[in-house]
């Protein structure tokens, strides 16, 4: 018994005053406590506990399952213990078939022995199978057998205690080992989206997939510099024996535009930690945003093609979208398309194809453009550059010589006078009156330009060049003089292109 | 003995709170598992969430979060479960029972059950 | 949710008789399957964890076996006091789930 020193308080005194004590099956087991501050006795045997308040223990007819450590306590919290062995030979084990190891740690096989006196005691592989040669173990008669160092390769070993007894070897009933994996990498995270874009007032909820070897791997979602514990929900799945895997969701179920920011999937094991976020932006409605992908102001030449090209976000989803031209809407000669085929994708291209433009083709080409919240438009002022053409070339009566163009850009109209027979004509002759004519066509069409000169200044017999030109090309019409005596006549008036 | 002992059967109103109990005894109370197991009238088990005593770690059935609380007092070997506001569909059997100790801490079965708490919801 | 299907719903046999209940999972739960034995108006009782091992003090007659997606329950005589309701449980994973049940009764 121990002993202290006088004034300190002690521990208690069991009667009889031995560690172990063995006694036989249907035996009286009768265990005295003495301790003026008694408080209890407990009796634990594998995961089982009982308290007795009663200072004597007292068991009329012991079982084998009466066998394990008795512990007196005081008021102190002092205690003393002894360890009871029932010895029944139809009963040489408890045990507790629950047998879980921790990789590289040492498991404890859970059958302790109703008799200590029994030999050999070990571990035995099932159906007559030998143990692993690396498996190494500790028998302990009063707790059972501790393997040490669990491997992987150990899981679900079948296993069973055994003793000699009277010289045959008696086993226990069945052990299957499950080996825990220690973590030898972080855990594997990763999310059903990057990014979120919702509407006031619609559900937020996102997925992270946790991978690692065993369940034993914490994750939580955190939001980016906040505390608040997150509500999530959880999905998990052994797929094989050092596979498991867990689908934690987050749900907002009405998300608000304060709700916007970075929410981070954590998950760390023993071994480290890693994470993922995603990012959720909640606008108070939808938007359309169109980006030209030209200058909205458009130069083509005549009968040249050109792509009329937007890019725009739209959230929600584009319902409907269309391109018009002097209000009439184009059922072809266009296409729209997805700038991605992300989920997340927002961003979309609309292009309007026209081919072989003619001068007549030039205006405003809109693209309209609709969801759920909102609508949208961009105009394109489409130019069709055309090589000017000579309308009119006439004598008025007033003597003067005029001539009308028209083209795009604006056509400038110069006059050349050549004397005789020469084919250049290389005198300028400056013009009296120059206007732009307002043209009774649409706008975008050609420019009208009327030009005149007084014929009266030519003396000799030639030819008077009306020249219009433009950056696309250039037209000329004639008109020849001939005198007879004091009269001037105009010979038909011609034109020649000159490219 | 190794045994779950839960509180007594209850009758309430609708929108009225309610915590029901469940003990153990005769083993560890830290080293396992407890999980809560619904039968409603005529129907079949289920489960419901398990906490783990020594840290209050907890996990539910997605159509029970929110809905329902589990928690435990490790001093006193006692896990509760608790309504804020109770509906008539609440009326079942309620048992809590033990998890074998299962490697990963809850992935085994259920291997000791208390006696049931009969909740009735009714106007 | 991993869903766990009992067949049959209910049977009929006589004392005696050799029973076998099967539970089906829709996706594999290695051998992380319980059994059950339900009688009116009392709590559950494990019969059977991981899938084939009997629990302690439970009658030699029951048996379970199978692992991956199926899993049977044999009762190898049926006993009078065997006619009670027959669960099967997953604990795979999270949430873990039960089988509609089985109810065994007296032909």
């Known amino acids: 018994q121990p002993s202290v020193s006088p004034g300190e308080p002690s521990p208690p005194s069991i009667h009889p005053g031995k560690s172990d004590l063995i006694v036989r099956v249907g035996d009286e087991i009768r265990l005295l406590c003495t301790d003026p501050g008694f408080v209890k006795w407990t009796f634990e045997i594998l995961d089982e506990t009982n308290e007795n308040k009663q200072n004597e223990w007292i068991t009329e007819k012991a079982e084998a399952t009466n066998t394990g450590k008795y512990t007196c306590t005081n008021k102190h919290g002092l205690s003393n213990s002894i360890y009871v062995f029932v010895r029944d030979p139809a009963k040489l084990f408890l045990v507790d078939r629950s047998l879980y190891g921790k990789e590289d740690n040492d498991t404890l096989v859970r059958c302790p022995l109703t008799d200590p006196e029994v030999t050999n005691y070990s571990l035995k592989g099932c159906q007559g199978k030998p143990l692993p040669k690396d498996l190494r173990f500790i028998p302990d008669p009063k707790a059972g057998i501790m393997i040490k160092s669990v491997k992987r390769a150990y899981h679900r070993l079948c296993l069973h205690c055994s003793v000699d007894q009277e010289g045959k070897s008696v086993l226990s009933e069945k052990f299957i080992l499950k080996v825990r994996p220690a973590f030898k990498a972080v855990p594997v995270v990763s999310v059903s989206k990057a990014s979120y874009l919702l509407r006031e007032g619609e559900e937020f909820t996102v997925t992270c997939t946790i991978k690692d070897v065993s369940s034993s791997v914490y994750s939580t979602w955190k939001r980016e510099n906040s505390q608040t514990k997150l509500q999530e929900k959880y999905n998990s799945w052994h797929h094989g024996d050092f596979n498991y895997e867990r689908q934690a969701t987050l749900t907002i179920s009405s998300a608000r535009v304060n709700d916007s920011g970075v929410f981070m999937c954590y998950a760390n094991n023993t071994f480290g930690s890693a994470n993922v976020t995603t990012t959720l932006e909640v606008v108070d409605k939808g938007f359309i945003n169109i980006f030209p992908m030209i200058n909205t102001t458009v130069f083509v030449n005549d009968g040249e093609n050109v792509d009329l090209i937007v890019e725009y976000e739209a959230f929600p989803k584009p319902e409907h979208q269309q391109w018009i031209y002097m209000n009439r809407t184009f059922t072809d000669k266009w296409e729209d398309y997805p700038k991605s085929e992300n989920e997340s994708n927002i961003r979309y291209v609309s292009e309007l194809h026209l081919t072989r433009l003619k001068g007549t083709e030039g205006g405003t080409y809109t693209f309209l453009v609709s969801n759920s919240d909102v609508n949208a438009a961009i105009a394109f002022n489409v130019y069709v550059n055309t090589k000017p053409e000579i309308l009119t070339y006439d004598r008025l009566v007033n003597g003067m010589l005029q001539c009308v163009a028209a083209g795009f850009p604006e056509p400038t109209i110069d006059w050349y006078f050549c004397p005789g027979t020469e084919q250049r004509c290389s005198a300028s002759v400056l013009p009296v009156d120059v206007q732009t004519l307002n043209s009774s066509g649409p706008p975008f069409g050609k420019l009208v330009v009327q030009s005149s000169i007084d014929s009266s200044a030519f003396k000799h017999n030639g030819t008077v060049e009306c020249k219009a030109y433009n950056d696309v090309g250039k037209t000329s019409a004639y008109f020849n003089f001939a005198f007879k005596g004091n009269n001037k006549e105009q010979i038909h008036p011609h034109t020649l292109f000159t490219p | 003995e190794v045994q779950l002992v839960q509180s007594g059967a209850e009758v309430k109103k609708p929108g009225e709170s309610l915590k029901i109990s469940c003990k153990g005894s005769?083993?560890?109370?830290?080293?396992?598992?407890i999980g809560w197991v619904r039968q409603m009238p005529g129907k079949g088990l289920e489960w419901m969430a398990i906490i783990n005593p020594r840290d209050s770690d907890t996990r539910y059935r997605p159509s029970f979060q929110g809905q329902v609380t589990i928690s435990a007092d490790k001093s006193i070997s006692t896990a509760y479960l608790q309504w804020s506001s109770l509906k008539a569909s609440d009326t079942a059997m309620y048992y809590c029972a033990r998890h074998g100790r299962g490697y990963e801490g809850y992935e085994g079965a259920f291997d000791i059950w208390g006696q049931g708490t009969l909740v009735t919801v009714s106007s | 949710d991993i869903q766990m299907t009992q067949s049959p719903s209910s049977l009929s046999a006589s004392v005696g008789d050799r029973v076998t209940i099967t539970c089906r999972s829709s996706?594999?739960?290695?051998?992380?399957l319980g059994w059950y034995q339900q009688k009116p108006g009392k709590a559950p009782k494990l019969l059977i964890y991981d899938a084939s091992n009997l629990e302690t003090g439970v009658p030699s007659r029951f048996s379970g076996s199978g692992s991956g997606t199926d899993f049977t329950l044999t009762i190898s005589s049926l006993q009078p006091e065997d006619f009670a309701t027959y669960y099967c449980q997953q604990a795979n994973g999270f949430p873990l789930t039960f089988g509609g049940g089985t109810k065994v009764e007296i032909k």
């Open positions: 996706q594999g739960i290695r051998s992380d």
């Open positions: 005769g083993y560890s109370f830290t080293n396992y598992w």
